[in-house]
Interface confidence: low
């Protein structure tokens, strides 16, 4: 006589801030009506009431008003619980009790997760490094859950396990910030990578830093520029770093410094005959005259535009000659996407809708991802177009065609691949049949 209540064996994984469905079902017997149904969801351990349905009516949420049943599906034996805006504190076991004439129950586990941010890397000390120096590299990643696994490796992919200290601290929402410190003795040069893994999401966030210790001058002037592109936001100022090692007795009168566009050889800025010859590039460049004598030949580029993107070569001539090229990568963040729906009213399950996600004035071209409320990627029936305006900034429009279920959340994520900046919007469509009492 016991009623068979079915729940998933595996934990339900839900991202913090999203909605989760805790599935629970039973088989209604002939003649079953909702008036006969008593349904209780409670926390398995504490027995705290979460949500109930009794006397033919949804008794509502007893859990911070963040739960809902699927009232139009109850009559078909679907006792699932929708938990909205999942928090870390929600993690645990929920028991679904169903009573009609007979009684049954089963427990389902909720596993909460949050992706870790792209790690930021810092170096201490961060200048005048020589082979043999000991440096401390810190890798920091934020707002993830559960606790992360952190891996370090060198440029060849060899794991670095010695001298690693990792700490993880939970904030008031229960999300973890992870800080991992690697102490390493520098070789001639080296790349050090930090990988932060979310064990539940199997999501890896990684960053790396390349350290090239300075070597002593050998005849030619050694001109040093950053290996990685300089990333500059449209409209801001960028510094293209370039340095050389002055010999004893060096004076600015001996210096010839030329900045030019690597590809076209167009002159950008120059310093010759002991004088700053000024900008040849739309009057938007400047040197750091007070620092030139110390070997700092860096160039300041003001009010960066998309058209500035590319390679700049720094030529330094004293008695000897040297040069190096630095890349400028221009970027502009995408706006928070606006979501439009067509049609946008009288939507019903089974209807085909067109959801348009629009984000504006970003650079470079975006990557667009769609996913449903469970975080499952939606790849079919997506058309994305990107159009550059006269400033070279892109407006992105991505169109998803989807057939509605009873209800659903559709999220659009517009990623700036250079800034690793994600802008996202979502739309929740509820088109379920009427049931009493109201819950929507």
């Amino acid at each position: 006589g016991a009623l068979e209540v079915q729940v998933p064996e595996d934990p339900v994984v839900a991202l913090v801030g999203t909605d989760a469905t805790l599935c629970c079902s039973f088989s209604p017997e002939p003649g079953f009506s909702l008036a006969q149904l008593n349904l209780i969801w409670q926390l398995t351990d504490t027995k705290q009431l979460v949500h109930s349905f009794a006397e033919g009516q949804d008794q509502g949420s007893a859990y911070a008003n963040r739960t809902a049943l699927f009232p139009d599906l109850l009559a078909q034996g679907n006792a699932s619980l929708r938990l909205q805006r999942v928090r870390v504190a929600d993690e645990g076991s929920f028991t679904c009790f169903v009573s009609i004439r007979d009684f049954g129950s089963a427990a389902v586990s909720l596993q909460v997760a949050a992706p870790y941010s792209k790690p930021s890397m810092t170096l201490e000390p961060n200048k005048d490094l020589r082979p043999g120096d000991t440096v401390t590299i810190t890798c920091s990643s934020y707002q993830g859950y559960p606790e992360a696994e952190v891996f370090w490796q060198d440029g060849q992919g060899v794991p670095l396990t010695g001298n690693v200290t990792t700490s993880q601290m939970a904030n008031e929402q229960g999300l973890f910030d992870v800080h991992s410190i690697l102490r390493v003795v520098l070789g001639a040069n080296g790349t050090y990578s930090c990988l932060v893994r979310n064990p539940v999401l199997q999501q890896d966030a990684h960053s790396s830093v390349t350290i090239t210790p300075q070597r002593s001058p050998t005849g030619a002037v050694e001109v040093q520029v950053p290996e990685d592109p300089v990333v500059a936001l449209v409209g801001t100022d960028a510094t293209l770093r370039c340095s050389f090692s002055p010999e004893p007795g060096f004076s600015l009168a001996q210096l010839n410094l030329i900045w030019q566009l690597t590809d076209t050889k167009q002159l950008v800025h120059s310093f010759t005959e002991g004088r700053d010859q000024g900008s040849a590039y739309a009057n938007r460049t400047a040197l750091f005259p007070d620092l030139l004598a110390q070997g700092n030949a860096s160039l300041r580029l003001q009010r960066v535009r998309v058209a500035d993107e590319g390679s700049f070569t720094c030529f330094v001539s004293i008695r000897d000659f040297g040069s190096a090229a630095v890349s400028l990568q221009v970027a502009a963040p995408y706006s928070k996407p606006s979501m439009t729906l067509e049609p946008n009213k009288d939507l019903r399950p089974g209807d085909t809708v067109t959801i348009t996600c629009s984000s504006y004035r970003g650079y470079p071209e975006a990557e667009v991802f769609w996913q449903d409320g469970q975080g499952v990627p939606l790849t079919g029936n997506v058309t994305t177009s990107q159009m550059a305006n006269e400033q070279g900034l892109f407006d992105v429009h991505s169109v998803l065609r989807v057939v509605l279920g009873a209800n659903g959340t559709y999220s659009c994520l517009v990623r700036n691949p250079v800034l690793q900046q994600d802008a996202h919007g979502s739309v929740t469509i509820t088109g379920q049949p009427m049931t009493f009492p109201p819950e929507a």
Partner: antibody
């Protein structure tokens, strides 16, 4: 466009039965519930209950339990109201009205069916 | 059951003048989800009722903006800023917070 078309007027004797139909068009019938509302002559509106068109489960207001039956034929997108053992006080206009699906209102109504019970 | 009481019973109005109808419920109409399911319907002479306002203050599609709804808890009001001849009929308030859904007794708006 959404339409609810009800069957024509009925004149019945006390003790007889009547079956009123409500044919829906212009939307997916099984996506939204249907309500039944009674209006006695010169009186206001009374909500009789509703039927879940997805599963066929009816819900009746207390005063309409027993002699009143809501049913469906989803193959022809039609809902029915059957009243048995008719009494003089059942004389009224009976309306079917669609749930809007979001706000717990009745957004589209049939034109009404007049049922007159008289000996 | 929730009792809905409307006043006045009859409301004669001159075209172009404003009109106001009151509706009071015997219990609060705030649902446990914090939403208030109070609606207004108009039944024009010889016609079926039609939805005017849903959830206290939201005009249904096609309803002129001279109609507005307000209120909270147990006291609600429907206002017509400038009555027109086509506005005549019986106005009903209705609640769907509690089952069974119930209607007010109606207010008959007439043109003077």
């Amino acid at each position: 466009q959404v339409q609810l078309v009800q069957s024509g007027s009925e004149l019945k004797k006390p003790g007889a039965s009547v079956k009123v139909s409500c044919k829906a068009s212009g939307y997916t019938f099984t996506n939204l519930g249907l309500n039944w509302v009674r209006q006695a002559p010169g009186q206001g509106l009374e909500w009789m209950g509703w039927i879940n068109t997805a599963g066929g489960q009816p819900t009746y207001a207390e005063d309409f339990k027993g002699r009143f039956v809501f049913s469906l034929d989803t193959s022809v997108s039609t809902a029915y109201l059957q009243i048995s053992s008719l009494k003089a006080e059942d004389t009224a206009v009976y309306y079917c009205a669609r749930d809007d699906g979001y706000y717990y209102t009745m957004d589209y109504w049939g034109q009404g069916t007049t049922v007159t019970v008289s000996s | 059951d929730i009792v809905m009481t409307q006043s006045p019973l009859s409301l004669p109005v001159t075209p172009g003048e404003p009109a106001s109808i009151s509706c009071r419920s015997s219990q609060s109409l705030v649902h446990s989800n914090a939403k208030t399911y109070l609606h207004w319907y108009l039944q024009k002479p010889g016609q079926s009722p039609q939805l005017l306002i849903y959830k206290v203050s939201n005009r249904f599609s096609g309803v002129p903006d001279r109609f507005s709804g307000s209120g909270s808890g147990t006291d609600f009001t429907l206002k017509i800023s400038r009555v027109e001849a086509e506005d005549v009929g019986v106005y009903y308030c209705s609640q769907s917070t509690h089952v069974p859904w119930t209607f007010g007794g109606g207010t008959k708006l007439e043109i003077k």
